[in-house]
């Protein structure tokens, strides 16, 4: 059943003489493996003998390879499902049908393959796209039915015979469907490509020209124009005329009208390659160009600049800026309509001629309130000289000058006045506005730029004011050199650095923090009486009588100031001590004695100790000393020491008598 | 300015004695007591005792009694600390100091006793 | 006699921070207590006497407090130069006692 036979393979295959034929081929004989195989060159059947005559190309056996005559046809498939060929070279007797015999165990099948062998390379065909407009890439395509392993060939671009710039790419294609050679060329055409021959060339390995085709490229472009002017450099004075003439160079299509722009706009009732200006004013200045259309769309000419020159008119100034801060920098600028532009200027301040301004800018790099006022400018070209314009008005503006603070009281000023002071300042733009005062305090001002200051402190030691525009001046400080008593008088203790005992050189020092005027006297008294005049109070040797509360006094012009009472304590050992007997010296035998160790210390005495008359100390340490019943033997002479933290006293010896009572004298 | 001047560094054998002085300027002696104070290296301070150069009067605490005797010059406005018996214990600086609670101080006298 | 227990014996703190020494007599003592202050190599500086009159020149951050028994020196805000070892002193009876010292150093 021969439909069990499917082949797959180009239906013909091209060649030239001595080239070569690759021929993609697939099958399948569904009944088995392919056993013989046989190429025919032009088969024909003989129904007599029931078989294909013709050439045998090649020929394979189960049994092994027939060896062929030419090692030029290779069957290079394989027994199930490859039946692909290759011719090498290939000769134009080739031309015609080749037959595939194939023979499987039970089935038997011819195939069918037309080869078109020419005598020379034949050419390749070039596809363009329908239309090609400038500037627009298009593909350009080169086409050759043909391609095969064992001869390499390649295809070239040329434009007008030149090898194309462009990047070419290549593809072949070796296939059951198809079997071919393409370049494809991606171009962008100009107008001026229009016309103009394009050529791919076949060439083999070697680069050695096999053939071609040509196309001439139809570039699609608005119309190509060229602009001329009388005078050619377009270059004329007011009344003068001006012929402009456009020509095409190239459109295609045709081109169907024509216009005329000055400075981009369309120039009404001018639809002629002719443009006539009679009589030009110097508003027809500008950029001409003419514009003629075709159904790509509008071409346009280069664009010529007429110039119409003419005197400077009346000039402008300009300022950067104005109103300007002293110090700053300004620019001025003359502004005058002229053609060509003016090459010389005049400057003015205030009508009055700027020596050495000549340029069109005049730069001032630190302005200063002397360059206020109004500036003109006068421009100057080869046609004339324009007329001075109305100038511009510089306005320079300044923090207040001169500021100074002013105290309007007779002097001196003593603490607790009313002191009133005003802020002068010499000039100032803008005007001053307000004013301020350092320090700043609750200050009264009455009046602007004046400021009254009721119960002066000692303290306010100077005031400046600021007069104040735009920004603030400041005046320098003025001292108001208020006079007051002095201030802070207090005692200091100088030596000893702690306590003072009695005996100590002591030195008190009345200090004070400040006074003015600085001339001053001291006073120092104790319980309302003078004691000395001098800053320190000096005891060479401090008595406890010398205790007590002091102070000392500061006086000035303006006051005197007294320190707080300080008191001044005097450490010192028990002194004065005695011994006091109750009920007295001479006491009755059985009766109470006691003794009393009276003594002047500070601190008090804290521990007292009793000696009796062999200096033997008694085992009694309290100030009263109590002996009861007394006793005969316990007459004699007494004593007792006084400590505190200071040091020790001793009294003198006080006898005590005691005397029989009437009993024991009965008794004798 | 109150000053105490104390005698220079004293280095002397055990067992021997040793006389410290201490001079008043800016001030007389007699003003007030003159206390003396021992401080050991690196230790705290200890009073010792006092004179008042006035009268000779003189207090000395228990444990440097025995030890340590006070006395004054008042014409050379100089109190003197002798001490005696000396060992490694006595080495101290020894402070002169006077009035009030101990407000002005002399400098120091380093005592080393080493043999 | 009397004797003065100090605390503490060392102590590390602060610049800027409020130090407190303290003082304890075995027996009242009538506020009759002087601190004082010595620095290596020195002679003590009396800073306060009477518990809490401070001595004239002595920065004002020093202070005392205290009665009876118990005493105290603060030193409100640390500085530098306050380090050092401080000592108490009582001067209400003889023989005069010292507290056993405090070595304050910056932290």
């Known amino acids: 059943d021969s439909s069990k036979w499917v082949f797959e393979h180009p239906e013909t295959l091209y060649a030239w003489e001595g080239a070569c034929v690759w021929i993609p081929c697939t099958y399948r004989a569904l009944d088995g493996d392919l056993e013989s195989f046989i190429l025919f060159h032009n088969p024909e059947y003989n129904k007599n003998t029931s078989k294909f005559d013709g050439t045998r190309l090649y020929e394979s056996t189960k049994d092994g390879k027939v060896p062929s005559e030419q090692k030029r046809v290779q069957f290079l498939g394989d027994k199930n499902k490859n039946c692909t060929l290759s011719i090498h070279p290939v000769h134009l007797n080739d031309s015609g049908q080749l037959g595939l015999r194939m023979e499987s165990k039970t089935e038997k099948w011819m195939e069918r393959i037309h080869l078109n062998v020419s005598e020379r390379p034949f050419p390749p065909h070039i596809q363009l796209p329908p239309e090609i407009q400038e500037s627009q890439e298009v593909t350009l395509t080169c086409l050759l039915n043909f391609s095969c392993y064992g001869y390499p060939i390649q295809l070239q671009w040329l434009l007008e015979g030149v090898p194309m710039r462009q990047a070419a790419v290549t593809s072949t294609s070796l296939t059951i469907k198809s079997v071919f050679t393409r370049s494809e060329l991606k171009f962008s055409p100009q107008w001026s490509h229009h016309g103009k021959i394009v050529t791919c060339q076949l060439q083999d390995a070697d680069g050695k020209f096999l053939s071609n085709d040509t196309v001439q490229l139809n570039v699609k472009h608005t119309p190509k124009l060229e602009i001329k002017v009388t005078p050619s450099d377009a270059i004329v004075r007011e009344g003068d005329s001006v012929t402009m003439t456009c020509e095409v160079s190239s459109s295609n299509p045709e081109y169907t009208t024509v216009s005329w722009l000055k400075d981009g706009t369309s120039l009404k009732k001018q639809n002629t390659f002719t443009l006539n200006l009679r009589e030009v004013t110097k508003d027809q200045s500008g950029k001409y160009c003419c514009q003629v259309s075709n159904d790509v769309g509008p071409g346009r000419s280069e664009e010529v600049f007429l110039q119409v020159q003419y005197a400077p008119e009346p000039s402008t100034v300009q300022i950067l800026h104005s109103p300007a801060v002293e110090g700053s920098q300004v620019e001025f600028l003359c502004m005058s309509l002229a053609n060509p532009l003016p090459t010389n200027y005049t400057w003015y301040h205030n009508g009055k001629e700027m020596q050495g301004r000549t340029e069109e800018k005049v730069h001032i790099p630190k302005i200063l309130p002397w360059h206020a006022g109004t500036y003109s400018c006068v421009a100057e070209n080869i046609l004339g000289t324009g007329q001075r314009g109305p100038g511009a008005e510089l306005d320079v503006q300044y923090p207040p000058k001169k500021v100074t603070t002013v105290i309007q009281n007779p002097m001196p000023i003593r603490e607790g006045d009313t002191v009133t002071l005003s802020c002068n300042y010499n000039s100032s733009n803008p005007s001053v506005t307000r004013y301020e005062w350092k320090p700043h305090g609750a200050w009264e001002e009455p009046s602007l730029g004046v400021l009254k200051i009721q119960n002066v402190g000692w303290d306010n030691t100077t005031i400046a004011c600021a007069a104040c525009n735009s920004w603030c001046s400041w005046a320098s400080p003025v001292a108001l050199n208020v006079q007051y008593a002095p201030r802070d008088v207090r005692v200091r203790k100088i030596k000893p650095l702690s306590e003072i005992h009695s005996g100590n050189s002591v030195s008190l020092q009345c200090d004070f923090s400040s006074s003015h005027p600085k001339e001053v006297q001291f006073f120092w008294e104790k319980n309302g009486r003078l004691l000395g005049k001098e800053s320190q109070l000096n005891f060479d040797s401090i008595s406890p009588e010398d205790a007590g509360s002091y102070s000392c006094w500061v006086n000035n012009s303006i006051g005197q100031t007294a320190s707080k009472a300080w008191t001044l304590e005097v450490l010192y050992a028990p002194r004065r001590l005695r011994v006091s007997m109750s009920p007295g010296d001479q006491v009755m035998e059985g009766k109470s004695a006691t003794l009393t160790c009276e003594s002047d210390a500070n601190p008090p005495v804290s521990h007292y100790t009793w000696f009796d008359w062999n200096n033997q100390s008694l085992p009694y340490h309290s100030q009263k000393l109590r002996l009861e019943p007394v006793k005969v033997q316990h007459s004699g002479a007494y004593w007792c020491q006084g400590t505190n933290s200071v040091g020790k006293g001793r009294s003198p010896l006080s006898t005590l008598t005691v005397y029989y009572s009437p009993e024991t004298i009965g008794r004798r | 300015a109150v000053q105490l001047q104390q005698s220079g560094v004293e280095l002397v054998r055990p067992g021997a004695s040793v006389k410290l002085s201490c001079t008043g300027s800016d001030f007389n002696i007699k003003e007030d007591y003159i206390h003396w104070v021992k401080q050991r290296p690196e230790q705290g301070l200890e009073w010792i005792g006092w004179i008042d150069p006035e009268n000779g009067d003189t207090e000395y605490a228990s444990k440097f009694q025995g030890k340590a005797t006070i006395t004054a010059d008042t014409s050379s406005n100089t109190a003197y600390l002798q001490l005696s018996s000396l060992t490694s214990e006595d080495t101290a600086v020894y402070y002169c100091?006077?009035?009030?609670?101990?407000?002005?101080w002399g400098q120091g006298t380093t005592l080393t006793v080493s043999s | 006699d009397i004797k003065m227990t100090q605390s503490p014996s060392s102590m590390y703190a602060f610049l800027g921070e409020r130090v407190t020494i303290t003082c304890k007599a075995s027996q009242g003592i009538n506020s009759f207590l002087t601190w004082f202050q010595q620095k290596p190599g020195k002679s003590p500086k009396t800073l306060i006497y009477r518990a809490n009159r401070l001595v004239d020149g002595v920065p004002s951050r020093f202070s005392g407090s205290g009665s009876g028994q118990d005493y105290s020196l603060t030193i409100s805000s640390l500085e530098y130069e306050d380090v050092g070892i401080y000592y108490c002193?009582?001067?209400?009876?003889?023989?005069?006692?010292f507290g056993g010292g405090t070595k304050l150093e910056i932290k």
């Open positions: 002193l009582q001067y209400d009876e003889f023989p005069r006692t």
């Open positions: 100091a006077t009035y009030g609670s101990l407000d002005y």
